[in-house]
Structures are given as C-alpha cells and as structure tokens.
C-alpha cells in the first residue's frame, strides 16, 4: 500500500531572466527513493539516480543545475518556460509517486511565490 505524499512548491511565479528552484519532498513513507525524474509536459529535464547520479537532458543542459538535494534549479527563464513540471519519485517497494508544480514566468517584477500544497 502506498502511504506516502509528495509535497511540492505548488504554483510559483518568477521573473523572466531569473532562476527558480523546483522542489518536491516525499514524506509519510519508509520507502527507499531510488530515482527522481523531472519532466516538463512531454519532455525530460533531468534524472537523479541514487547510484548513478545526475543526468541532464541536452535541451536543458545549459540552464538547468542539479539540486539543491533532489530538486532542480532552472536558470535564464523565458516566458516559454511557463507550464507544468512534474517530479516523479521512483521508490522501493512502494512504486511511483508524482508531484506537480505550475510555473508562471512573468515579464514584470511582480512575481511572488505561491503557497505550498500536497498531492496525496
């Protein structure tokens, strides 16, 4: 039975040209995290494997930095970066947990962080 929950940074906004940290946290389970995949709609951003380390997709390698922790730092933001991001936690023995973050990249300086929320 999957008992864990993913806590994410929720709906967030950031300024064009700036950077943002995408962060998820798995709680309420003793399952071992073997890998975390970061995805944006239909493409992979990065993988963090507990043994093999980080893999950054070529389309993001110039502006994605691993971490902090299992999170991902997205740099040099453009308006095209607006959209949904997913953290997929591969765990043993539970299986897969998925968290969702919505990022809005704004032209102006009115960007503020949204509230944190949980996905069961």
């Amino acid at each position: 039975m999957m008992t864990g929950t993913i806590e994410t940074t929720g709906n967030i906004s950031a300024e064009k040209g700036g950077s943002i940290i995408l962060q998820c946290h798995l709680s309420s389970t003793t399952a071992q995290v073997t890998q975390v995949n970061w995805e944006q709609q239909d493409q992979l951003l990065a993988i963090c494997n507990a043994d093999l380390g980080w893999h950054i997709s070529p389309s993001f390698k110039d502006r994605v930095a691993p971490g902090p922790g299992l999170g991902l730092t997205l740099q040099s933001l453009t308006v095209n970066d607006t959209g949904e991001y997913f953290c997929i936690y591969h765990t043993y023995p539970d299986g897969t947990y998925t968290g969702r973050i919505f990022l809005e990249v704004l032209e102006s300086s009115v960007a503020e962080h949204g509230a944190r929320f949980q996905i069961p």
Epitope: N37, E39, Q43, L44, N49, D51, L52, G53, H55, P58
Partner: antibody, heavy 115, light 107 residues
Framework: EVQLQQSGPELVKPGASVKISCKTS????????LHWVKQSHGKNLEWIGG????????NYNQKFKVKASLTIDKSSNTVYMELRSLSSEDSAVYYC????????WGQGTTLTVSS | DIVMTQSHKIMSTSLGDRVNITCKAS??????VAWYQQRPGQSPRLLIY???YRHTGVPDRFTGSGSGTDITFTISSVQTEDLAVYYC?????????FGGGTKLEIK
C-alpha cells in the same frame, strides 16, 4: 579520442568465474558513468549494470545482481566485471559502454562457457 | 521492468527509400530513449539520444521523434551502409532496457 579497450576472449568451464576489463582513455574518467551490456546469440541486448566513478555508486539489473560484480581501478581508469558460477547461458559477447545513452562502446569480449 | 517493443523484426527496403522504425514502451519513458545501429561483427553505435538528438558525426538522414510510449526512428533516404540492425533503448528508469532490434535489409 575516447576509447574503451576490452580484454580478450575467454573460454572457461561451467561453474568457474571470469573477470573481464575495460580500460578507458581520451576523457575525464570521473565525468561519465560506465556500463556493461550482454549480447546473446548476436541479437538481444541486456543492460547488466552501471558504475558511477564520481561517487562509487553501482546500479545493477536485478537479473544480474547475483551473477555480476562491477569494480573499478581509478588509478588506471579501468572498470571490471566479474561473472561467477558460469553456465552455458552466460556464453555471450559482453560490452562496456559509457554514459546514460551509450555514446561510446568497447569492442566486446566474447565469453564461451564450455566443458 | 519497462518492455521496449520493436514490432518489426525485419524491414525490407530499397535504396533511397524513407524508413520508419517504431518502438513502443510498456510504460512512460518520456524522452529518455536512444537508438543504436549495429552492423554485423561490430559493436553497437549510438545514433540518437534523448529521443531526437543526433550523436556527434551522425548523418542528418537519421532522425528520432516521439515521447512517452511511442518512439520513432527515421532514415530519410536509405544508403547501402545503413543495412544493419537498429535497437531502441530506454534509460528513463533502471533496469535500462532495449528493444529486440529491427533488421534493415534490401528487397
């Protein structure tokens, strides 16, 4: 030029063990993961496991966890794979390969298990 | 484990033809897919990684597309040296797995 140079062919008896090597050159050893792949009957490819020279992490395909053991010698930029309790089913060509998508491959080591 | 299925074991083609080789994943693999070419007696050679990126030195007649569970590899105009076996592979999650291969041959 990136090169992965594997050890030569092996003929071993059932029940024995064998250790094959893959010496790397032409790049910074700790920057890329290294993997072993089995090819049986000149067709099917199977990932055995991989090694991260940067942190010493090893990830095995569960199917090969008992069969294979991966080690490295950082001083010579060489990775090794030991295969134990060999049977005829282990007869195959074994390749070492670099990176997540295997961008460079060794020439292959042919293992024949026969009495 | 994720199963990568290449439904065509053999594809017959003529020189100059356009060929699509498909690979279907049993689970979502996003764009964590590579394509390899293996000629007889040789080691596999990386052609495409991250579903659509050509490896260094690979001719532009080779392209890759797709995401999720349906991945496609295309040769826009088949040349004699392209006659080989082509494999897809996922590295979305371990254990990394390969398709069974598609042999490209002349009609």
């Amino acid at each position: 030029e990136v090169q992965l140079q594997q050890s030569g062919p092996e003929l071993v008896k059932p029940g024995a063990s064998v250790k094959i090597s893959c010496k790397t050159s032409g790049y910074t050893f700790s920057d890329y993961t290294l993997h072993w792949v089995k090819q049986s009957h000149g067709k099917n490819l199977e990932w055995i496991g991989g090694f991260n020279p940067n942190n010493g992490g090893t990830n095995y395909n569960q199917k090969f966890k008992v069969k294979a053991s991966l080690t490295i010698d950082k001083s010579s930029n060489t990775v090794y794979m030991e295969l134990r309790s060999l049977s005829s089913e282990d007869s195959a060509v074994y390749y070492c390969a670099r990176n997540w998508a295997f961008d460079y491959w060794g020439q292959g080591t042919t293992l024949t298990v026969s009495s | 484990d994720i199963v990568m299925t290449q439904s065509h074991k053999i594809m017959s083609t003529s020189l100059g033809d356009r060929v699509n080789i498909t690979c279907k994943a049993s689970q979502h693999v996003s764009t964590a897919v590579a394509w390899y070419q293996q000629r007889p007696g040789q080691s596999p050679r990386l052609l495409i990684y991250s579903a659509s990126y050509r490896h260094t030195g690979v001719p532009d007649r080779f392209t890759g597309s797709g995401s999720g569970t349906d991945i496609t590899f295309t040769i826009s105009s088949v040349q004699t040296e392209d006659l080989a076996v082509y494999y897809c592979q996922q590295y979305y999650t371990t254990p990394w797995t390969f398709g069974g291969g598609t042999k490209l041959e002349i009609k």
